[in-house]
Structures are given as structure tokens and as C-alpha cells.
Interface confidence: low
């Protein structure tokens, strides 16, 4: 009678992580009597995957009814494959004895695992930057296999070209990581913008993974200041307004100075939001001109988001106004137009 052969028809099998891998194995004879075992790897360090005779292998199921005496199909299915399962699997026939002895091995089936990349994580610069500056964003994704992967950067749907990408390790590995750095030029309109890192891989079936970063966490749009003077009904009073426009983020402190002396300091609270995400705010100062003998230099000084203060001055001519003794400068609270943006 012809000697038993162990046939592993598949030289290689590729499976996506999380799926099941079927490893085929048939024998050509029922003789000699003895169990089949599956191993990963060869030699003394090989790892037992399945023993037909004994043991508990919760991830392994037999494809055919291997308990039948006449069964010659010893194919197995391994569930919930991970990159760590990659390797060469051998179907080995043992001869019954005390102990059982190895009789013949199949040629082996190499299992490669298509690992899905992890959700890309995008991180931006530690400190805010102003429009026209270039900032760097990094994108990282891990755990994918095979090594081939495509990474793209977008800003508001527009693809970016200024980026560098590395895939590690360079050599063979059960799984890989990708790291990319993109350079983005900020504009004043970027408060609502997003930077998106998109990763495409064979395991994703054409549905790429995306990681995002909101430029609202990166950008600082410095305010523009305008100081104007409006007449008021009371003939000795002048209303001076400081319009603080198009700033982001909201953190802002305003100080009024009269001839270089601090008159009032206030913090922007009730602001108006523009469609582009920046804010406007208005503060006013009600000045009793009769309290001043000479012209007054009024300065609106703004410290935005911890940056050096910027200021705008306005010269208030008081010579034309009648003087009244004993009158002090009066300063009202902040004025603002409060509204929600919908």
C-alpha cells in the first residue's frame, strides 16, 4: 500500500485581522493510525496550535467531521486572527504509540495577516500660530499589514502636497506603523477649517480611515482695532468706542488709557461671532470733557491670548468744550452686541 502523504495545498493564505483563517490539510491514507497535530513554525521551538487527540484550543475548529474514523481531512479554522498569528503552519501526522511519534509533515502554509491600520491620530503644534505662518501637523497610524499603505492630507477637502511620510520598520514585520508630517499655511479664515489625514489600506475595502484636527485649536487671529468718537446728547460728554474685530480665540483683555493713565480694564465676555468663527467686540468710554483742561489722548490697549498688547489711540480735542470744575471722568461698562450665530 502507498505510503501516507500529508498534503497542504496552499503555499500561502492571507487573512484580514479579526477574520478567520482556514488552513487546509488532507492525508492520503488511514494508515498508520495516529493523531494529526498543527504547529506554527518548525524545529524544537515550534508552537502547538491544535492537537486532534487532546487539549483545549478555543480559537481552532475543524473544518470537517474529524472524529469520524475514516476522515482524511484535517483542515482547521483559526478565529479572530491578529498580526501575531502570522507565520508558517505545518500539518503533522503522528504514529500512535507511547508516546506518539512524528511520522510525516506537510510542506507548510504561510499565513500572512492583513492588519487594519488604527484610526489615524492627528496632532498639531503645541502653541498657537497666526495667519500666514506655516504650522506642522503629525498623523500616526499603527498595526497594519501588509506594509503598502497610502496616506493623504486634506485641508477643508483640498488635498495638501507638502508632507513627509515614513513607514516603520523598514524590514519584515508582523505589523507596521506610519508617521507623516504635513505643513499647513494658516489663513485668517481657518478658524472653522479642519486638517484631515486619510489612510487607505487594502484591509479597508476602499473606505479610508480619517483623523482630523480642528485649526481652531491651532490658530490665533490677532484683532484689528478702531477707535472712534461719537457725540452724545449731554454737551459735556463724548462717547469713545473701541471696535475690536476679527480675533480668535476669545481670550482678550482691553485697557483704556487716558493720557497714559489706566482708566479701566475689562475682559471680553459677550462677543459677536462672525461667520468665519472669529469674534468682534466693542468697548466704549464715556468721557466728561469738562474734567479736562487740555486735549486728551485716549488709548485702547488690547492684550489678546497672552500676546504683547496692541493699541490704538484717539486724540480728543477739549478746547471747544465749556469747562466745569469738580467733574470727574466717568467710564461706563463694556458695550457689546450679543447674538447667537445660527
Amino acid at each position: 500500500e502507498e505510503e501516507l502523504q500529508v498534503i497542504q495545498p496552499d503555499k500561502s493564505v492571507s487573512v484580514a485581522a479579526g477574520e478567520s483563517a482556514i488552513l487546509h490539510c488532507t492525508v492520503t491514507s488511514l494508515i498508520p493510525v495516529g493523531p494529526i497535530q498543527w504547529f506554527r513554525g518548525a524545529g524544537p521551538a515550534r508552537e502547538l496550535i491544535y492537537n486532534q487527540k487532546e487539549g483545549h484550543f478555543p480559537r481552532v475548529t475543524t473544518v470537517s467531521e474529524s472524529t469520524k474514523r475514516e476522515n482524511m481531512d484535517f483542515s482547521i479554522s483559526i478565529s479572530n486572527i491578529t498580526p501575531a498569528d502570522a507565520g508558517t503552519y505545518y500539518c503533522v501526522k503522528f504514529r500512535k504509540g507511547s508516546p506518539d511519534t512524528e511520522f510525516k509533515s506537510g510542506a507548510g502554509t504561510e499565513l500572512s495577516v492583513r492588519g487594519k491600520p488604527s484610526a489615524p491620530v492627528v496632532s498639531g503644534p503645541a502653541a498657537r500660530a497666526t495667519p500666514q505662518h506655516t504650522v506642522s501637523f503629525t498623523c500616526e497610524s499603527h498595526g497594519f499589514s501588509p506594509r503598502d499603505i497610502t496616506l493623504k492630507w486634506f485641508k477643508n477637502g483640498n488635498e495638501l502636497s507638502d508632507f513627509q511620510t515614513n513607514v516603520d520598520p523598514v524590514g519584515e514585520s508582523v505589523s507596521y506603523s506610519i508617521h507623516s508630517t504635513a505643513k499647513v499655511v494658516l489663513t485668517r479664515e481657518d478658524v472653522h477649517s479642519q486638517v484631515i489625514c486619510e489612510v487607505a489600506h487594502v484591509t479597508l475595502q476602499g473606505d479610508p480611515l480619517r483623523g482630523t484636527a480642528n485649526l481652531s485649536e491651532t490658530i490665533r487671529v490677532p484683532p484689528t482695532l478702531e477707535v472712534t468718537q461719537q457725540p452724545v446728547r449731554a454737551e459735556n460728554q463724548v462717547n469713545v468706542t473701541c471696535q475690536v474685530r476679527k480675533f480668535y480665540p476669545q481670550r482678550l483683555q482691553l485697557t483704556w488709557l487716558e493720557n497714559g493713565n489706566v482708566s479701566r480694564t475689562e475682559t471680553a465676555s459677550t462677543v459677536t461671532e462672525n461667520k468665519d468663527g472669529t469674534y468682534n467686540w466693542m468697548s466704549w468710554l464715556l468721557v466728561n470733557v469738562s474734567a479736562h483742561r487740555d486735549d486728551v489722548k485716549l488709548t485702547c490697549q488690547v492684550e489678546h491670548d497672552g500676546q504683547p498688547a496692541v493699541s490704538k489711540s484717539h486724540d480728543l480735542k477739549v478746547s471747544a468744550h465749556p469747562k466745569e470744575q469738580g467733574s470727574n471722568t466717568a467710564a461706563e461698562n463694556t458695550g457689546s452686541n450679543e447674538r447667537n450665530i445660527y
Partner: antibody, heavy 120, light 107 residues
Framework: QVQLVESGGGVVQPGRSLRLSCAAS????????MIWVRQAPGKGLEWVAS????????YYADSVKGRFTISRDNSKNRLYLQMNSLRAEDTAVYYC?????????????WGQGTMVTVSS | DTQLTQSPSSLSASVGQRVTITCGAS??????MHWYQQKPGKQPKLLIY???NLEAGVPSRFSGSGSGTDFTLTISSLQPEDFATYYC?????????FGQGTKLEIK
Amino acid sequence: QVQLVESGGGVVQPGRSLRLSCAASGFTFSDYGMIWVRQAPGKGLEWVASISSSSSYIYYADSVKGRFTISRDNSKNRLYLQMNSLRAEDTAVYYCARRYYGFNYPFDYWGQGTMVTVSS
Amino acid sequence: DTQLTQSPSSLSASVGQRVTITCGASKSVRTYMHWYQQKPGKQPKLLIYSASNLEAGVPSRFSGSGSGTDFTLTISSLQPEDFATYYCQQSNEPPYTFGQGTKLEIK
């Protein structure tokens, strides 16, 4: 899989209120912007309101501004639409939808809709 | 507000035919135009996003093009399941307006 299920529709008299709810599952609700869109019988789609993932940004159509309020509870994976001072022209199927990523992105998943009828 | 005008409002076509629907915007919406399909009694389904990107799971016979104010949805070879109403929608700025719809009927 992603699921959005609207509820709370019904028949209501003009001037009265109704609160719609949208239960989300199958995705990380707190990562996504959400939208209400309506469709009057035999008519086209009309965007009603949007809310960002953290509720920081809320927008309304002019036709509902001041009467409708969109809100969300990320701990319960729910989106709401409080509709006050209802009018006959608010009669429509109301859909909740998910907006992936930023402001400029489309509505990639929609609920099956809930019917609101405003009639005396 | 950005007005969207779809053309035609309705269209009769045969299976296998190539069909084009256009959407014009009253001002530039850059590439932030999306296309949806809606069948009677059902919720809308996203087909094309950001002018030309095919949504996952949508057959490749659907394609989109355009930028600025003029956009096109093309179905290269009509299938029986494609008879529905199609809407364009802009997300360049709120309010996020829809076109009035194009009803595609079987000839």
C-alpha cells in the same frame, strides 16, 4: 452599523409645541455633528438646523429661527429638536442625519424620519 | 443664502441610458457640493460628496464633477434601481441649502 432612529412626531395644533428625538447607535456620537432636515409632503428637502459635536456651533434655517431649538446629549447618544409655536407650514417628515468631520462635509447617514402634522 | 437650481426638474430615461443632472449655485460653493438619492417613502442616501468623491458602497456608474457654481451628477448606464429623486446640497456655508430635486422616471 450606524443607526439613527427619530421619534416624537405626531399631530399637533398650530401654536403648540413638540419635541423630536433621535437615538444614535453604531458610532461614537460625540465625535459627529448632527443635523435636522425636513421634507414637506410632495416637496423637496429643507435643512432645518445643525449642531456641532460639542454643541459649540449651532445654526438654524431662517424659517425656524427663534421657534426651534436643536440640542444634544452626548451621554445618552441623543439629538433633539424642540419645536415651539408650530405652524401649518412646519408639516413635514423630519429626518435626523449625521455629518462626518467638519462643517463642509455632507450628511452621510440619515434616519428613517418621523412625521409631524400641524393642523387645527 | 446660496440658492441651488437643479436641471432638469424631471427626466424620463431608459435602462442602460446615460443620464446627466446639473446643479447651479447662485454663488461659489468651492467643491462643497454633495449629491443624494431618495426613493419614495425612504430617507435620502449619500452618493457623491465634495463634488466628485464616490461614497463607500455606491456603484461606480455614479460620478460627480464640477467646482465653484456648476456641478454635474452622471449615471453612466441606468439600472432599474436608479429611478428615484436626486438632490444636490451645498455645505460651503449655512444655511445648508438643497436643490429642488430631479425626479428620474422610467421611460
